[in-house]
Interface confidence: medium
């Protein structure tokens, strides 16, 4: 057959798998006269041979790791041994098989990491090599953490980049590592070839000792800085320090202020760069950041708090250029005229903003000076000497000095003398009848207009009308707004109406003046009006506070543990009864009054997590309307499943008699969760009596090899007990049995005489 395995002499390339015993020729070169024989030179390594007739072959298995390419030359010779053709290059490419295990460069690594280091930032690399071809899975390495010691509450503090071997902290490690509690950790790291994806991969392990060092990258105590400082700026106020020299510090203003008065130097010292003004901003919160030379953050930012301390740098201010009060002609001595409320921008409730009031001038001084007095601290003006007469002096002007401990301000008050309030407001009708509203009427709706009139001096406190609801609305669901020009009252809904608590409300209004009535005049029935508010029911279902309630517990919580709770409210205010729907596993009960959910049976993550049930909230009484929400219970794994065999191993056999010790491979598994790594089982023989005949050796975390120790076995079935421990917390052990039959074989299968065919083993070793 010309072409594939034979042909003329020309440059050629062949690919051959390493490790394979020769099974066929490589090529048959055909000679063209005068050539009669062939000669092979180059990197033959005494493996490649060419027969005189041109048959190129190899005589033993190749090893890619010794030589990955053999560069050969083939020449054609004539009868006298003279080269008449060639030599031509023949290239043998050796294809890789997985015949080398990965090995770590060190059997032990040591490293250190600071507490609170950034998750995912490598602090140590482990490195393994594999002589196989890295361009194929045979040389592609996969790193894994096998175990972390101590392992606190099943939480992994460390993680490894499967491809690079970079070890870093997990989020939990960053938060929880504390040298005061645990100054050192040990990791066992495995490396597998085949990218970790094959059960035939080779592996190696190494040990990593990690020291946890203290983190001095901590937020400083809050700083107090006096405002308007006259000291030379910048002023150092606090400091931060990265754990190692060479960090680049910066400040981040999260509030994006137009003026950010802080800076940091490359020692980590923080300065205020200009005087602060408490009245502009009384506190600052910003962040200090440490970065490496490439500008990458070394850790999380630190929060810096600066409180600005008040000094008395603000004078009192008047509420308005002129404050206007009214006083009736006949008012008695001591009556309150009104209160002047000045302001001070300095810090509240301190001496810097504590104000004193004093009248410094009254004009006109008719009929005398000192007609008014002001309460020193409260600012309340009172009539001091006698009643006033509008026809003599209709208006007084007061100049009032308002002072804090350092500053004085003058405020101006105008006091208008008005007619006596001897007329009461009179409602246009005493009964506004019935009004029927649904309980879901919008807040802010105007539901009624009321009107009263007052014959006193217009646009004074004697004729102004204020409407109050004095009866029938203890919940404050209604309010009345007054139009100051017309004295019309608009009754509005301030809070939701509620059929359940107030189906009928008998409302009574009172119309009053802000000014007191003269002595002897009293409000009478004319100043009162009533109306009846009838609220109709709008029944609504209870409302859950969430669409989905979620809780997380370990699968082994004690029965009776509160695992969560739900809340719903009924718009009508009816009581609610809670129940569960869809609790198919009978794991939960709900307190029908409080909504608390308890476990009533053992939980099992392996049966399915999260466990989803529906919670129902039903009105008690009424129309029994109900609403449904979801409750999801996430079950955290505990090590509660012992290891077992991964498949059925009946039918294992060895041909009897054994010519040499034999072995078989088996796989274990368990049903628990293995988040950070695969299982890490250890294997041993189930009883001491088996040790003379058998031995178990671990291949990796899930596979082991059972080997015979000798060849002297009887022709029968042996049941080999294997103890498999999962090394979990708590550790669980399973004892499994591997039935192995030693039998006479015919063509590699167990032979049984007729009548003895039951249970023939099918797997030969």
């Amino acid at each position: 057959q010309e072409g594939k395995f034979s042909g003329p002499l020309k440059p050629m390339t062949f690919s051959i798998y390493e490790g394979q015993e020769p099974s066929q020729i490589i090529f048959q070169f055909k000679a063209n006269p005068p050539a009669v024989t062939f000669e092979l030179t180059g990197e033959t390594d005494n493996i490649f041979v060419i027969e005189r007739e041109g048959l190129l072959y190899y005589n033993r298995a190749l090893d890619r790791e010794t030589r990955s390419t053999h560069n050969l030359q083939v020449a054609a010779l004539d009868a006298n041994g003279i080269i008449v053709e060639g030599p031509v290059p023949i290239t043998i490419k050796v294809k890789d098989i997985n015949d080398n295990r990965p090995t770590f460069l060190q059997s032990k690594y040591e490293g250190s990491v600071r507490q609170n280091s950034r998750p995912g930032k490598p602090f140590l690399y482990v490195n393994a090599t594999d002589l196989d071809d890295p361009a194929t899975p045979n040389g592609q390495l996969y790193y894994q953490i096998v175990i972390q010691l101590p392992m606190i509450n099943n939480v992994m503090y460390f993680q490894i980049n499967n491809k690079t071997g970079a070890i870093s902290l997990t989020r939990e490690g960053s938060q929880e590592l504390n040298p005061a509690k645990n100054p050192s950790y040990n990791l066992v790291i495995s490396v597998k070839d085949m990218g970790g994806q094959s059960e035939n991969s080779f592996s190696d392990t190494t040990s990593v000792d990690i020291i946890v060092t203290e983190n001095i990258w901590k937020a400083p105590k809050p700083v107090e800085m006096v405002e308007n400082s006259t000291d030379p700026h910048p002023i150092k106020i606090t400091q931060v320090r990265w754990n190692d020299p060479g960090a680049q510090y910066s400040l981040v203003d999260k509030e994006k202020l137009p003026r950010f008065p802080f800076s940091i130097d490359q020692e980590g010292d923080i300065y205020v760069t200009q005087p602060l003004d408490r009245e502009e901003k009384d506190a600052y919160v910003f962040y200090a950041v440490a970065k490496d030379e490439y500008g990458k953050p070394l850790s999380y930012p630190l929060e810096i708090h600066v409180k600005v301390k008040d000094i008395n740098d603000n004078p009192p201010t008047c509420p308005s250029p002129v404050t206007v009060f009214e006083v009736q002609e006949n008012e008695r001595l001591g009556n309150s005229i009104g209160t002047l409320t000045a302001h001070d921008r300095d810090e509240e409730n301190t001496a810097n903003s504590f104000l004193n009031y004093r009248i410094v001038e009254q004009t006109p001084k008719l009929p005398m000076d000192g007609l008014f007095l002001i309460q020193t601290y409260a600012g309340m003006l009172q009539l001091a000497k006698q009643s006033l007469k509008k026809q003599d002096t209709p208006q007084y002007n007061l100049t009032i000095e308002v002072s804090d401990k350092d500053f004085k301000t003058l405020c101006f008050v105008q006091i208008n003398v008005i007619d006596i309030n001897d007329q009461i407001p009179i409602f246009e009708k005493s009964d506004y009848g019935n009004l029927t509203l649904a309980e879901d009427t919008n807040i802010g709706s105007t539901i009624l207009t009321i009107q009263a009139t007052d014959a006193d001096e217009p646009f004074t406190g004697s004729s102004k009308i204020l409407y109050h609801i004095i009866k029938g609305d203890s919940e404050g669901r209604l309010g009345v707004d007054t139009d100051p020009h017309t004295n019309t009252g608009y009754v509005i809904i301030k809070k939701p109406l509620d059929f359940e608590t107030a189906a009928v409300s008998n409302i009574v209004f009172k119309a009053e003046n802000p000014e007191p009535l003269v002595f002897g005049v009293k409000y009478n029935a004319s100043s009162f009006a009533k109306f009846t508010l009838i609220v109709t029911d709008v029944n609504e279902a209870p409302q859950f506070s969430q669409h989905v309630f979620q809780a997380k517990v370990s699968e082994d919580v004690a029965i009776g543990t509160k695992v969560g709770n739900v809340t719903a409210k009924d718009p009508e205010g009816l009581d609610i009864s809670y129940s569960l729907r869809g609790d198919t596993r009978g794991w939960l009960k709900i307190d029908h009054v409080t909504g608390e959910i308890f476990s009533v049976a053992p939980l099992d993550r392996e049966a399915g997590s999260p466990y989803r049930v529906q919670v129902v909230a039903t009105e008690v009484g009424g129309s029994s309307l109900s609403s449904v929400s979801e409750f999801h219970l996430i079950l955290m794994d505990v090590n509660d499943n012992p290891p077992r065999l991964a498949k059925d191993y009946t039918g294992l056999f060895f041909c009897h008699p054994l010519s040499a010790p034999g072995s078989l491979i088996f796989e274990a598994t368990d049903d628990d969760q293995h988040l950070f790594r695969g299982p890490h089982f250890t294997f041993s023989l189930g009883s001491g009596s088996l040790q003379n005949d058998w031995e178990v050796s671990k291949i990796n975390g899930t596979h082991a090899r059972l080997s015979t120790r000798h060849t002297e076995f009887e022709e029968r079935e042996y049941v080999v007990l294997i103890r498999i421990n999962d090394g979990g917390r708590p550790p669980l052990e399973g004892i499994v049995s591997l039935p192995v039959t030693f039998c006479s074989c015919v063509e590699g299968s167990c032979f049984r005489p007729a009548g003895h065919q039951t249970g023939i083993p099918t797997v030969g070793m």
Epitope: N153, N154, K181, S554, A558, G560, K562, P730
Partner: antibody, heavy 122, light 107 residues
Framework: EVQLVESGGGVVRPGGSLRLSCAAS????????MSWVRQAPGKGLEWVSG????????YYADSVRGRFTISRDNAKNSLYLQMNSLRAEDTALYYC???????????????WGQGTLVTVSS | DIQMTQSPSSLSASVGDRVTITCRAS??????LGWYQQKPGKAPKRLIY???SLQSGVPSRFSGSGSGTEFTLTISSLQPEDFATYYC?????????FGPGTKVEIK
């Protein structure tokens, strides 16, 4: 060092009240449930009350339900037992014991205090 | 409530003896069971958790086994410091309950 120290025991008349405290140190207190266990003189151990890590769930033995209240202050790393309407049969050494982390119950009751003595006598 | 019983209530043994204490629960408690040792005037000390796991720092002569309703604590070779009272505790179901105790005395 992980440590629990009880205090607040003493002599009290029947019907009286007492408040026990337990100060925790050396571990992250707010990660763990806690319990009170008592032991009457010459008798065995009796679980009295338990509380989950954040104080949201409390549990009591029937013998004390309605009279005793368990609480905790995570900011102060402290556990408390308010005992009202005390009876002679409440006389015991009261131990504070660390429960399990969050709700991981297999690992409960690994750390115990030395106990504080409560004597109810007229 | 789950009742816990222990047997024997007391036993006398010599140094080097193998000692077994049994604890029974009135209903299944999975493996939520611990064994505690208490010496006079001292607080209880946990020996075994999760029915069969040895507390770190506890000598390996102590072992636990069982699941469900029947559990045993075994001391493979009694030492002088092991003379004490031993309690089992179930924390499978509220209220948690202790066994009445087994006193191990010197013969």
């Amino acid at each position: 060092e992980v440590q629990l120290v009880e205090s607040g025991g003493g002599v009290v008349r029947p019907g009286g009240s007492l408040r026990l405290s337990c100060a925790a140190s050396g571990f992250t207190f707010d990660n763990y449930g806690m319990s009170w266990v008592r032991q009457a003189p010459g008798k065995g151990l009796e679980w009295v009350s338990g509380i989950n890590w954040n104080g949201g769930s409390t549990y009591y033995a029937d013998s004390v339900r309605g009279r005793f209240t368990i609480s905790r202050d995570n900011a102060k790393n402290s556990l408390y037992l308010q005992m009202n309407s005390l009876r002679a049969e409440d006389t015991a050494l009261y131990y504070c014991a660390r429960g399990s982390r969050y709700n991981w119950s297999y690992d409960a009751f690994d750390i115990w205090g030395q106990g504080t003595l409560v004597t109810v006598s007229s | 409530d789950i009742q816990m019983t222990q047997s024997p209530s007391s036993l006398s043994a010599s140094v080097g003896d193998r000692v077994t204490i049994t604890c029974r629960a009135s209903q299944g408690v999975r493996n939520a069971l611990g064994w505690y040792q208490q010496k006079p005037g001292k607080a209880p000390k946990r020996l075994i958790y999760a029915a069969s796991s040895l507390q770190s720092g506890v000598p390996s002569r102590f072992s636990g086994s069982g699941s469900g309703t029947e559990f045993t604590l075994t001391i493979s070779s009694l030492q002088p410091e092991d003379f004490a009272t031993y309690y089992c505790l179930q924390h499978n179901s509220y209220p948690f309950t202790f066994g009445p105790g087994t006193k191990v005395e010197i013969k």
